[in-house]
Interface confidence: low
Amino acid sequence: HNTTVFQGVAGQSLQVSCPYDSMKHWGRRKAWCRQLGEKGPCQRVVSTHNLWLLSFLRRWNGSTAITDDTLGGTLTITLRNLQPHDAGLYQCQSLHGSEADTLRKVLVEVLADPLDHRDAGDLWFPGESESFEDAHVEHSISRSLLEGEIPFPPTS
């Protein structure tokens, strides 16, 4: 799996979207988990409604919400009041029995508050480039692809 980068501004909300094949994952609940260490487990943060038919209902755990458009095939996670400690590597998962398939690996970046009505995208600085081998930057705020590695985020 490639890693998709979502960038948010501290104190604001960030929406993460995870598209999937609605037929392949029909009837499956979904979850959002945080990766603990490069080889460590993915710790569940929040999962969709226990009844799959009610997956469209938003469920919260603290400042994190999850909702699933099972027909359109899009899982949406909202991180409210984003804080620096929210930065890190996450996964969107599709659950079946005790197993979980990874729908998308997500790197959440938290950038400084855009004071003085600056464009939020300006706080994200690296320029655009032609290639980004192991990651894709999702346009949750204005910015573009960049080249280089994504080191594994610190877990502390």
């Epitope: 790197l107 600056r118 300006d122 706080l123 985020p153």
Partner: antibody, heavy 118, light 112 residues
Framework: QVHLQQSGSELRSPGSSVKLSCKDF?????????MSWVRQKPGHGFEWIGD????????IYGVKFEDKATLDADTVSNTAYLELNSLTSEDSAIYYC??????????WGQGTLVTVSA | DVVMTQTPLSLPVSLGDQASISCRSS???????????LQWYLQKPGQSPKLLIY???NRFSGVPDRFSGSGSGTDFTLRISRVEAEDLGVYFC?????????FGGGTKLEIK
């Protein structure tokens, strides 16, 4: 007033390494704003070395510096670091840390002079 | 890499004069997000550079309004309407639309 304080001048012999530091006195912004390192060589102008986002240690290097420089950051002391290895006379320069804002190198440290000489 | 070409290399002026510095990039600096990340800096002898203008035409905080930036695409200009003694130094442009970020060679503003 933004204040980035860099470590003092360094004299090194060829083949050795050096680690420069840059303390940011804005502890709230430091973890979540990109820090960039730039060097200035007389007659060669400015060269961008790389960026780091301290909160998650995300690093982006200029191709020229991928094997030369290592960027690091400590969010406890609000300090960014630049380590340069396998030094040659070509690495003699003033090295600046800068903090990003407005899509630009908005705030600059005072610079650290690195001299590589046998 | 994007090459930033600055002209002139040296600009002798009298105090109170208008001064113009040109910066040309080897490719368009319009970012995918619609912004143009072209900056102007001033470096005085023995000092760090200071940001004057960001995103082509926006003055950074504390920068006097005698400084103005203009241009688009690949051609950009910094103007100083009435040069004062404190304006003397080396001006350089920089782009941060494309990796790696690159810089112009500098223009030395000096007294005629």
């Amino acid at each position: 007033q933004v204040h980035l304080q860099q470590s003092g001048s360094e004299l090194r012999s060829p083949g050795s390494s050096v680690k420069l530091s840059c303390k940011d006195f804005d502890s709230e912004v430091f973890p979540i704003a990109y820090m960039s390192w730039v060097r200035q060589k007389p007659g060669h102008g400015f060269e961008w070395i790389g960026d780091i986002l301290p909160s998650i240690g995300r690093r982006i290097y200029g191709v020229k510096f991928e094997d030369k420089a290592t960027l690091d950051a400590d969010t406890v002391s609000n300090t960014a670091y630049l380590e340069l290895n396998s030094l040659t006379s070509e690495d003699s320069a003033i090295y600046y840390c800068t903090r990003k804002d407005y899509g630009s190198l908005a705030y600059w440290g005072q610079g650290t002079l690195v001299t590589v000489s046998a | 890499d994007v090459v930033m070409t600055q002209t002139p290399l040296s600009l002798p002026v009298s105090l109170g004069d208008q001064a113009s510095i040109s910066c040309r990039s080897s490719q368009s600096l319009v970012h995918i997000n619609g912004n143009t990340y072209l900056q102007w800096y001033l470096q005085k002898p023995g000092q760090s550079p200071k940001l004057l203008i960001y995103k082509v035409s926006n003055r950074f905080s504390g920068v006097p309004d005698r400084f103005s930036g203009s241009g688009s695409g690949t051609d950009f200009t910094l103007r100083i309407s009435r040069v004062e003694a404190e304006d003397l130094g080396v001006y350089f442009c920089s782009q941060s639309t494309h990796l790696p970020y690159t810089f112009g060679g500098g223009t030395k503003l000096e007294i005629k």
